[in-house]
């Protein structure tokens, strides 16, 4: 009488995450009276995946008829596949005992689940920096075997170098995991830029899984601040204007000051965009020279995003009060007890 | 559809031989363990002998040595030869079909009457 | 030899009643207890193997459980039908034996 074999086919089957897995396995003979079983893993710990004989395995299913005397063939099905079904399974046959007895176990077929990595989150730094600092954006995305894959930053479509990557765990599991951190160097022109970290993966038929990120989350275009006379006007009122511009993102307090006492306070809100992104802002005060004996300083004090504020000062020249028009006068860090008339801002 | 049909069951002295025989259908028999189950009237089952897919042949104590299980594939029929009845082997014979893998009866033939009584 | 012991021997119950027979083995079967009904003058029919396990066709009215030496069968709601004589048997080395019956009556 032949020796009883158990013979499982494949040394390794791959099947991608969600779908169905046949493990095949077939025994040379039917005797001795006794089940077969599957298990995933070898030795005292492994798994029961399934039993003929008994219990209740909802995923597993036989793929031929097990109650058909000359059916041989005990390959089952495993539905719905994840990543935790990964590993080493194994078809055994028993003698009908008390307990039964294991006489032969097949050589084992290796399952490797192929999952898709989840799509990935980029994160950005938790607060703002200016330009020409460097920030960094981390990338990260779960999930995925085999533990092969590939990622790539951008910036504006343009392919980034200073990053350090990590695939976690080092050593073999069900599923890993990506995390990816590129440090990206700002500038003023930023504010419409995008990174975008993509990963690739034998999953995903060459159709890359891209995650992104703006830039105009990261950063802060600090104002540039201009106060100017605008004109001298026959009634003897001086318009001064406070330009604030190519500024980001638009969180922005502009405070006059008259000799150093709040005169009015505006706060930046649904102003035009620059081309760049950035944004602009005027506020202007009239003065009225022939109310005032001694010079007037007048400051523009801006503060932007939380920042400290930056001012500018301006010194109306009382003394010299001209009554024609004058042209724009630049502003000064001198000035006297003046107090405004009219205030506005555009 | 699955069937087992026993015959040659009657009334036979003590001493005598009698050859019950089963006919299956709708199966192969050699693919299966046979089995025979007696029951004497107002009593329980009572296993008596199996043949299994290989030859190998069992038997329950009290017939050991006088009755003989084998069958006959091209017929697809098992037989029962019973030799030295006693009063005692008087029951409904049945012939049974053992399960795929762990030989649970699973097809019951209708039975067939033994009588030993002189 | 294994020996079956069922209990009780007979049992008088009622339409839509549970009734719960049990079987005890002499010794460890692990799970190979089946289950069969006689009805006077018919051959047994199989219910139950692997001590829980239906045979086709089998309502599921029909329950089984143990494993080792003690096991027991249930049927939830009776039907008239259901009356009938029970046996147990373990088949896990020769020589089989069954248990001596359960006799469930109409009360």
């Known amino acids: 009488e032949e020796e009883l074999q158990v013979i499982q086919p494949e040394k390794s089957v791959s099947v991608a995450a969600g779908d169905s897995a046949t493990l095949n396995c077939t025994v040379s003979s039917l005797i001795p009276v006794g089940p077969i079983q599957w298990f995933r893993g070898a030795g005292p710990g492994r798994e029961l995946i399934y039993n003929l004989k008994e219990g209740h395995f909802p995923r597993v299913t036989p793929v031929s008829d097990p109650t058909k005397r000359n059916n041989m063939d005990f390959s089952i099905r495993i539905s719905n596949i994840t990543p935790a079904d990964a590993g080493t399974y194994y078809c055994v046959k028993f003698r009908k005992g008390s307990p039964d007895v294991e006489l032969k176990s097949g050589a084992g077929t290796e399952l490797s689940v192929r999952a898709k990595p989840s799509a990935p989150v980029v994160s950005g730094p938790a607060v703002r920096a200016t330009a020409e600092h460097t920030v960094s954006f981390t990338c990260e995305s779960h999930g995925f075997s085999p533990r092969d894959i590939t990622l790539k930053w951008f910036k504006n479509g343009n392919e980034l170098s200073d990053f350090q990557t990590n695939v976690d765990p080092a050593g073999k599991s069900v599923s890993y995991s990506i995390r990816s951190t590129a440090r990206v160097v700002l500038t003023r022109r930023d504010v419409h830029s995008q990174v975008i970290c993509e990963v690739a993966h034998v999953t995903l038929q060459g159709d890359p899984l891209r995650g992104t990120a703006n830039l105009s989350e990261a950063i802060r275009v600090p104002p540039f601040l201009e106060v100017t006379q605008q004109s001298m006007r026959a009634d003897n009122q001086v318009n001064v204007t406070c330009q604030v511009t190519k500024f980001y993102p638009q969180r922005l307090q502009l405070t006059w000051l008259e000799n150093g006492n709040v005169s009015r306070t505006e706060m930046a809100s649904a102003l035009p965009e620059n081309k760049d992104g950035t944004y602009n802002w005027t506020s202007w005060l009239l003065v009225n020279v022939s109310a005032h004996r001694d010079d007037v300083k007048l400051t523009c004090q801006v503060e932007h995003d939380g920042q400290p504020a930056v001012n500018k000062s301006f010194s109306v020249k009382v003394s010299a009060h001209p009554k024609e028009q004058g042209s724009n006068t630049a502003a000064e860090n001198t000035g006297t007890n003046e107090r405004n008339i009219y205030g506005g801002s555009g | 559809e699955v069937q087992l049909v026993e015959s040659g069951g009657g009334l036979v002295q003590p001493g005598g031989s009698l050859r019950l025989s089963c006919a299956a259908s709708?199966?192969?028999?050699?693919?299966?363990?046979m089995h025979w189950v007696r029951q004497a009237t107002g009593k329980g089952l009572e296993w008596v002998s199996a043949?299994?897919?290989?030859?190998?042949?069992y038997y329950t104590g009290s017939v050991k040595g006088r009755f003989t299980i084998s069958r006959e594939n091209a017929k697809n029929s098992l037989y029962l030869q019973m030799n030295s009845l006693r009063a005692s082997d008087t029951a409904v014979y049945y012939c049974?079909?053992?399960?795929?893998?762990?030989?649970?009866?699973?097809?019951w033939g209708q039975g067939t009457m033994v009588t030993v009584s002189s | 030899d294994i020996q079956m012991t069922q209990s009780p021997s007979s049992l008088s119950a009622s339409v839509g009643d549970r009734v719960t027979i049990t079987c005890r083995a002499s010794?460890?079967?692990?799970?190979?207890l089946a289950w069969f009904q006689q009805k006077p003058g018919k051959a047994p029919k199989s219910l139950i193997y692997?001590?829980?396990s239906l045979h086709s066709g089998v309502p599921s009215k029909f329950s089984g459980s143990g494993s080792g030496t003690d096991f027991t069968l249930t049927i939830s709601s009776l039907q008239p039908e259901d009356f009938a004589t029970y046996y147990c048997?373990?088949?896990?080395?020769?020589?089989?034996?069954f248990g001596q019956g359960t006799k469930l009556e109409i009360k």
């Open positions: 049974v079909r053992g399960g795929v893998w762990d030989d649970a009866f699973d097809i």
């Open positions: 709708g199966f192969t028999l050699s693919s299966y363990d």
């Open positions: 043949i299994g897919t290989a030859g190998d042949t």
């Open positions: 010794q460890d079967i692990n799970n190979y």
């Open positions: 692997t001590a829980s």
């Open positions: 048997q373990q088949y896990v080395s020769y020589p089989y034996t």
